[in-house]
């Protein structure tokens, strides 16, 4: 089961609700962005293989006083099976490469828009 | 009390494309999920593809390359298209809610009948 | 895609007989399965999700048991409403796919 429950969801949903749930809200960031995102904030960039939704929380994680990431990254702690705290990092992240949050947000919503498309929920 | 019903031409030509229509009621489409159901004479039901509160899309793969799915907010409608369509596609086309955070479909349209007949 | 499969594809019945109709998912659904009811000419009616839930204003007659491969749905006293054709579905993951039905007559 996919736990969401106290994040985001209204309790346990299946994989493929959660990973749409989390395509929509990045959406919604991009949709409605007006002024930088997170006023301009740089963060590591990631490798999207295996295991990319703790590496993509460790790296958003680092950023704070943004209200417009702060869904996402509830929801991706919901896929993340440990617990990640800010300077946590793991050898997904390309660590000579910072990118601005939006930039980050975009490509991760391209890469899940693609998994959901080919049936990868899990 | 939210209340989907489709619209379209109930008669369509083989290599035509078939469009549809389904308003809401009640309810606004910048929120949950849009969904297309369809169901052949006699057959079972067959997941067609969804718009969400954001506009964002899902296609059924076996239907992607004939399939188009958009929206009207101004209108609170979807629209459904299916191209180069054949016999194959005659069937009941249901529009149908799927709340946010589920994957059941807890409110349907009454339906409409497209035959592909020349 | 997950393949669901139900049994029997049709049965027989009499008021106030207890039915029980099965799904079976060719994989792992956990609890995602729901149960649809559709009348001729109608469109489905949710009846249960989550395997067991009863959907709002669904009569206690019916319930819903089940989790992993193999589904069923159970009405413990067939009223002469209930005859109609009845679907699963798996929400595990997408695309959506729906059972054959299992249209219950008037024995």
């Known amino acids: 089961l996919t736990c969401l429950g106290g994040f985001a969801s209204p309790g346990p949903v299946p994989p493929s609700t959660a990973l749409r749930e989390l395509i929509e809200e990045l959406v919604n960031i991009t949709q409605n962005q007006k002024a930088p995102l997170c006023n301009g904030s740089m963060v590591w960039s990631i490798n999207l293989t295996a295991g990319m939704y703790c590496a993509a929380l460790e790296s958003l994680i680092n950023v704070s006083g943004c209200s417009a990431i702060e869904k996402t990254q509830r929801m991706l702690s919901g896929f993340c099976p440990h617990k990640v705290s800010a300077g946590q990092f793991s050898s997904l992240h390309v660590r000579d490469t910072k990118i601005e949050v939006a930039q980050f947000v975009k490509d991760l919503l391209l890469h899940l828009k693609k998994l959901f498309r080919e049936g990868q929920f899990n | 009390e939210v209340q989907l019903q489709e619209s379209g031409p109930g008669l369509v030509k083989p290599s035509e494309t078939l469009s549809l229509t389904c308003t809401v009621s009640g309810g606004s489409i910048s929120s949950d999920y849009w969904n297309w159901i369809r169901q052949p004479p006699g057959k079972g039901l067959e997941y067609m593809g969804y718009i969400s509160y954001n506009g964002n899309t899902y296609y059924n793969p076996s239907l992607k390359s004939q399939i188009t799915i958009s929206r009207d907010t101004s209108k609170n409608q979807l629209s459904l298209k299916l191209s180069s369509v054949t016999a194959a596609d005659t069937a009941v086309y249901y529009c149908?809610?799927?709340?946010?955070?589920?994957?059941?479909?807890?409110?349907w349209g009454q339906g409409t009948t497209v035959t592909v007949s020349s | 895609d997950i393949q669901m499969t139900q049994s029997p594809s049709s049965l027989s019945a009499s008021v106030g007989d207890r039915v029980t109709i099965t799904c079976h998912a060719s994989q792992n659904i956990n609890v995602w399965l729901s149960w649809y009811q559709q009348k001729p000419g109608k469109a489905p009616k949710l009846l249960i999700y989550?395997?067991?839930d009863l959907h709002t204003g669904v009569p206690s007659r019916f319930s819903g048991s089940g989790s992993g491969t193999d589904f069923t749905l159970t009405i413990s006293s067939l009223q002469p409403e209930d005859f109609a054709t009845y679907y699963c579905?798996?929400?595990?993951?997408?695309?959506?796919?729906f059972g054959g039905g299992t249209k219950v007559e008037i024995k």
């Open positions: 989550k395997a067991s």
């Open positions: 149908a809610r799927l709340a946010k955070w589920t994957w059941y479909f807890d409110i």
């Open positions: 579905q798996q929400g595990q993951s997408y695309p959506y796919t």
